[in-house]
Amino acid sequence: TLNSVLINSNAIKNLPPPLGGAGGQPGSAVSVAPGVLYEGGNKYQTLDNYQPYPCAEDEECGSDEYCSSPSRGAAGVGGVQICLACRKRRKRCMRHAMCCPGNYCKNGICMPSDHSHFPRGEIEESIIENLGNDHNAAAGDGYPRRTTLTSKIYHTKGQEGSVCLRSSDCAAGLCCARHFWSKICKPVLKEGQVCTKHKRKGSHGLEIFQRCYCGEGLACRIQKDHHQASNSSRLHTCQRH
């Protein structure tokens, strides 16, 4: 039987890779219940001082960051990738994730989103990394695979509760986040609402119920009156910059 542990996340693009090797191992808590966390060799860690956050893909970074090699050129070819600050409008880009929230990459330049920049019926190719996290599965089914997913993006924006593929599918003030085993449009977090701050690779856990990121002008920070609490129970909320 499966135990229950509660966790929420504001990492909203795609579910980040869960902890390596946690599935089915002795001593690892695999939980499948509302708001799930399972733990492998990595413990949750909270750092208040900024450190470069290693990543394998954009989804592992915050909403105002993207994953790339710190040096110019091909991202991550033979080198470590880290989360880098997003690029503001009119800056050069190679993909949407490089541009800051409210912008998208068009012709190599970050442009402001107008909520209808995908013409009706335009096909967007997105690569989803399937990391084969097959808990209790037969051996040999756990190798990484890449799947090319083709989908149509329409003008109509999803309302709260609508299923989505990415945040651009959702109406203003909503993001695309995991809910149970699916993805739906959820509200972007307001000031004072609880958020989850991921600062290190391996600290994501398996998040069945993700929260959105904090809204514009807000950052996910430790709540002041929780500074004395133990590392594992520090509460993060959306606060003014």
Epitope: L15, P18, I128, C164, F180, S182
Partner: antibody
Framework: QVQLVESGGGVVQPGRSLRLSCAAS????????MHWVRQAPGKGLGWVAV????????YYADSVKGRFTISRDNSKNTLYLQMNSLRAEDTAVYYC??????????WGQGTTVTVSS | DIVMTQSPLSLSVTPGQPASISCKSS???????????LYWYLQKPGQPPQLLIY???NRFSGVPDRFSGSGSGTDFTLKISRVEAEDVGVYYC?????????FGQGTKVEIK
């Protein structure tokens, strides 16, 4: 309109394998988690397995753990259930079911698996 | 696992009369999103289960208004205000707040 069509069932001997498929249409398959549920003859409903929208997370009922593998191909809008080391007690009608079961008929018509020597 | 307990397990009803089925869960089905993940299905002979009620009280499209669901937390009820011949079959409650999804044992409804 939302449709889930299961196939691949049949009569098989104990210890052998079978692969079920569920073809989905009428909804954004790649946004939804998918489940397999089964029903033994004259019995109630039992959950078998789930796979997340992107295939990264999978969970199984204790009774099928290590024998069954759930997978999906989002480019083909298809869900699979690979069933190995089949036992007599796996005899059932197998249904694929969509996660978030509030917005459309979330189950297929079912495919029958009979494990018998 | 969450245990779902239905009662009664069988019900014989005169057409036009009301019927009521109870479902109890071993833990609360109320989620932090405010929704309660409790469903009612009807399985007619030789057919797959069909959704009647989702999230306790919402009727699925095309379901007659004689069907209604109520309850909260761990106690739920399906009511049929006036049973008709076509309502025969086995009624199941189901929870989806966590996997494994679990079902009640089923309530067989027949016409007197």
């Amino acid at each position: 309109q939302v449709q889930l069509v299961e196939s691949g069932g049949g009569v098989v001997q104990p210890g052998r394998s079978l692969r079920l498929s569920c073809a989905a249409s009428g909804f954004t398959f790649s946004s939804y988690g998918m489940h397999w549920v089964r029903q033994a003859p004259g019995k109630g409903l039992g959950w078998v397995a789930v796979i997340s929208y992107d295939g990264s997370d999978k969970y199984y009922a204790d009774s099928v753990k290590g024998r069954f593998t759930i997978s999906r191909d989002n480019s083909k809008n298809t869900l699979y259930l690979q069933m190995n080391s089949l036992r007599a007690e796996d005899t059932a009608v197998y249904y694929c079911a969509r996660d978030l079961v509030d917005t459309a008929m979330p189950w297929g018509q079912g495919t029958t698996v009979t494990v018998s020597s | 696992d969450i245990v779902m307990t239905q009662s009664p397990l069988s019900l014989s009803v005169t057409p036009g009369q009301p019927a009521s089925i109870s479902c109890k869960s071993s833990q609360s089905l109320l989620h932090s999103d405010g929704k309660t993940y409790l469903y009612w299905y009807l399985q007619k002979p030789g057919q797959p289960p069909q959704l009647l009620i989702y999230e306790v009280s919402n009727r699925f499209s095309g379901v007659p208004d004689r069907f209604s669901g109520s309850g909260s937390g761990t106690d739920f009820t399906l009511k049929i205000s006036r049973v008709e011949a076509e309502d025969v079959g086995v009624y199941y409650c189901m929870q989806s707040i966590q996997v494994p999804w679990t079902f009640g044992q089923g309530t067989k409804v027949e016409i007197k």
